[in-house]
């Protein structure tokens, strides 16, 4: 069983999923309002968003006293965060600016990918090896969407029997999408294109917030029970509370290299020939050069206009 990394508003913690009755280890303490969290295992980096400080920060998990600001301007409510461990990029949602953005892992070369028809975007999950990203939106028209990680091919994949879609996670091995709905109190799964939808846990969950997966087990945080729960990812059976008495459980991830499988990085050689951003894409050649917001990509499709 994995270590579970979760945000707890005031801190980030790690707890062993097999021994959740033990106290969790504080990875980073003294925080204001840590909401979303993710990591790049191979780089030893943990990222989180703080919705009160309106910032995204990071630390090296062997040097937890070294907290760095990554994005500190232009954020209002960065509810969702995801690291592209392959292309070495950071993606985030903001439910008040109504944007989905991307940058380098250090926060540089920031680009707005989506800014239209977003209401309350929240969870975001990446599948870098196929070039797709997924996100939930619990606004007036709740939905789950999929798009290329380069901002292409945007498509609504779930828009029925959905109300407050919060948690979202991908099963890379079985190519499945799992999500938790806090108002309809369930966990459902589907194919990555939204087809073949099935219930995993039927409407019995008080307020599931964030969702992760490791091997055959789903793990999620619940706002109402202030705990982390788990069940079998196929059947929903064995539903149990594995860690309780959490101050304010927010985002959660299975903290393991297994959750960030290696694959060929199409941007790996010379940044794909791109002058600035090289983003994963779902279509051949599986990457797309891009420029920071406000800067034009030249006709060669590789170079950003001077001044970026």
């Amino acid at each position: 069983a994995p270590l579970l990394l979760y945000a707890n508003r005031r801190d980030l913690r790690l707890v062993d999923a097999t021994n959740g009755k033990e106290n969790a280890t504080i990875v980073v303490g003294g925080l204001e309002d840590a909401a979303a969290v993710d990591f790049v295992f191979s780089h030893g980096l943990i990222y989180w968003s703080d919705v009160s400080e309106e910032a995204i920060k990071r630390t090296e998990f062997n040097k937890t006293e070294s907290v760095q600001n990554v994005v500190v301007s232009g954020l209002l409510s960065p509810d969702g965060l995801a690291c592209d461990w392959l292309g070495e990029k950071l993606y985030w949602t903001d439910s008040e600016t109504n944007r989905i953005e991307v940058s380098n892992l250090d926060g540089s070369l920031r680009k707005v990918l989506f800014w239209q028809e977003l209401d309350q975007p929240r969870a975001i999950a990446l599948d870098p090896s196929s070039g797709f990203m997924y996100w939930t939106d619990w606004g007036e028209v709740p939905k789950i969407e999929r798009a290329g990680m380069d901002g292409s091919s945007r498509f609504i994949i779930i828009n029925s029997e959905i109300y407050w879609p919060n948690g979202l996670t991908l099963d890379y091995e079985e190519q499945k999408l799992y999500w938790a709905d806090a108002k309809l109190n369930f966990i459902h799964k589907s194919n990555l294109d939204g087809t073949n939808r099935q219930a995993v846990v039927k409407g019995s969950l008080p307020h599931p917030f964030a969702l992760t997966l490791f091997e055959d087990i789903l793990y999620w945080t619940d706002w109402s029970t202030h705990s982390i729960l788990a069940c079998n990812k196929y059947t929903g059976e064995g539903l149990r509370e594995i860690h309780s008495d959490i101050f304010s459980p927010m985002d959660i991830h299975a903290f393991s290299q297994q959750r960030q499988p290696n694959a060929t990085n199409p941007c790996g050689i010379d940044n794909g020939g791109c002058s600035h951003l090289c983003l994963m894409s779902p279509v051949k050649p599986f990457y797309q050069c891009a420029c920071p917001t406000g800067v034009k990509l030249l006709e060669n499709g590789k170079t950003c206009k001077d001044g970026a």
């Epitope: 508003r9 005031r10 204001e32 909401a35 009160s52 806090a182 307020h207």
Partner: antibody, heavy 123, light 108 residues
Framework: QVQLVESGGGLVQPGGSLRLSCAAS????????IHWVRQAPGKGLEWVSG????????HYADSVKGRFTISRDNSKNTLYLQMNSLRAEDTAVYYC????????????????WGQGTLVTVSS | DIELTQPPSVSVAPGQTARISCSGD??????VYWYQQKPGQAPVLVIY???KRPSGIPERFSGSNSGNTATLTISGTQAEDEADYYC???????????FGGGTKLTVL
Amino acid sequence: QVQLVESGGGLVQPGGSLRLSCAASGFTFSDYAIHWVRQAPGKGLEWVSGISYSGSSTHYADSVKGRFTISRDNSKNTLYLQMNSLRAEDTAVYYCARGSHGNIMAKRYFDFWGQGTLVTVSS
Amino acid sequence: DIELTQPPSVSVAPGQTARISCSGDNIRKKYVYWYQQKPGQAPVLVIYEDSKRPSGIPERFSGSNSGNTATLTISGTQAEDEADYYCSTADSGINNGVFGGGTKLTVL
């Protein structure tokens, strides 16, 4: 438009009971936390109690804990405050106020208020 | 819980800028909300999350929050702005609102 209408206030003797109601309209009641806030004559605002969107979570100010009970009926779009063992210092205008959307992470303010109902505790 | 302190009264001439302070230990670490209450009426939210204005609130209302003091600023104060103003904050864990004692704004 959002409307909150309180009722049930009146004159009651010390040690007595009263039940306040708040009828809501103009929004999806079951999506929001709702609160009671009171104001003693000539004094400031005091938060009294709050209840989560589903009713599963309730909170009380120390001054009313054990005496007041907040509840809601989402099928009737109505909030309640059962007040027992009333004291003279509970005399106030009681407002019901809409709190945060149930799925919001960090917003805890009261964006719409009713006009209030007066509770007078006196012998 | 943080204790919020406001001046009991502030006076301003019409058209001038009124500033109402709300102090509390490390208040910058909390979101601050401001409510306006006119005599015999219910409170109205005028500023949320330190500096954001709800729709329908005039642009002359603004807010800031740093150090140990949050400030509500009313630029070009009008007679209709005469009211009591309350600052408020809330703990991240639960929904208890904490209100300041209120400030009576008089427009001379």
